[in-house]
């Protein structure tokens, strides 16, 4: 026997107050699936989030982040706050890379600069903060 | 026992207006996302519009926006949607309806009273 909920589409949930027709989900909510019994509250990009796609009756919004921020975690569930190039975010705030060290992203960390002579070559160009040294031949 | 009972309905001419009243009892109105859902002649439920966030935001379908206000006065605990420039489609019987939030993060709604019939025609 087929569950009659399952043909209720996305956008709507299966009422089992009203002889399981299919109701539209309320507004701020969502289902993305057919034959759901409930809807799904959409999220709310607030504060450093910011609205890339508005939810609508089938798909949940999504966000991003404000400008001077970047998303991480799936779904950009954090935002973590950008540092220049030559720099890594820590604790305190962000930080010049060391000496030997670089970071020519926004985010991320320092990393070191490439090591020439473990490939039997030497440095072309000198390394920065925000740049990796050049090998040679 | 939560009883929501509405009013107001009628025969209007094209571009007429009308007030729709919902007496909410056994809930408080102001503490609840509260709204108006309607059902055209063999058509499906469609909200129509909301207070939602305990009063923070407003939600109208698109095809209400402009012509449709919904308020609500906490000390008669009634929800009103006040109705302009009415269009044949908007002939539908229209219910006030609760948001229902449950435990486990879902959302549905609910209405229990019978609905007001608005007829547009001229």
């Known amino acids: 026997l087929q569950d009659p909920c399952s043909n209720c589409p996305a956008g709507t949930f299966c009422d089992n107050n009203r002889n399981q027709i299919c109701s539209p989900c309320p507004p701020n909510s969502f289902s993305s699936a057919g034959g759901q019994r409930t809807c799904d509250i959409c999220r709310q990009c607030k504060g450093v989030f910011r609205t890339r796609k508005e939810c609508s009756s089938t798909s949940n919004a999504e966000c991003d982040c404000t400008p001077g921020f970047h998303c991480l975690g799936a779904g950009c569930s954090m935002c973590e706050q950008d540092c220049k190039q030559g720099q890594e975010l820590t604790k305190k705030g962000c930080k010049d890379c060391c000496f030997g060290t670089f970071n020519d992203q926004k985010r991320g960390i320092c990393r070191p600069w490439t090591n020439c002579s473990l490939d039997g070559k030497s440095v072309l160009v000198n390394g920065t903060k925000e740049r990796d040294v050049v090998c040679g031949p | 026992e939560v009883q929501l009972l509405e009013s107001g309905g009628g025969l209007v001419q094209p571009g007429g207006s009308l007030r729709l009243s919902c007496a909410a009892s056994?809930?408080?109105?102001?503490?609840?996302?509260v709204g108006w859902v309607r059902q055209a002649p063999g058509k499906g439920l469609e909200w129509v519009s909301a207070?939602?966030?305990?009063?923070?935001?407003?939600y109208y379908a698109e095809s209400v926006k402009g012509r449709f206000t919904i308020s609500r006065d906490n000390a008669k605990n009634t929800l009103y949607l006040q109705m302009s420039s009415l269009r044949a489609e908007d002939t539908a019987v229209y219910y006030c309806a609760r948001v229902v939030y449950h435990a486990g993060g879902g959302v549905t709604f609910d209405y229990r009273g019978q609905g007001t019939q608005v007829t547009v025609s001229s």
């Open positions: 207070i939602l966030d305990f009063g923070g935001s407003t």
């Open positions: 056994g809930f408080t109105l102001s503490a609840e996302d």
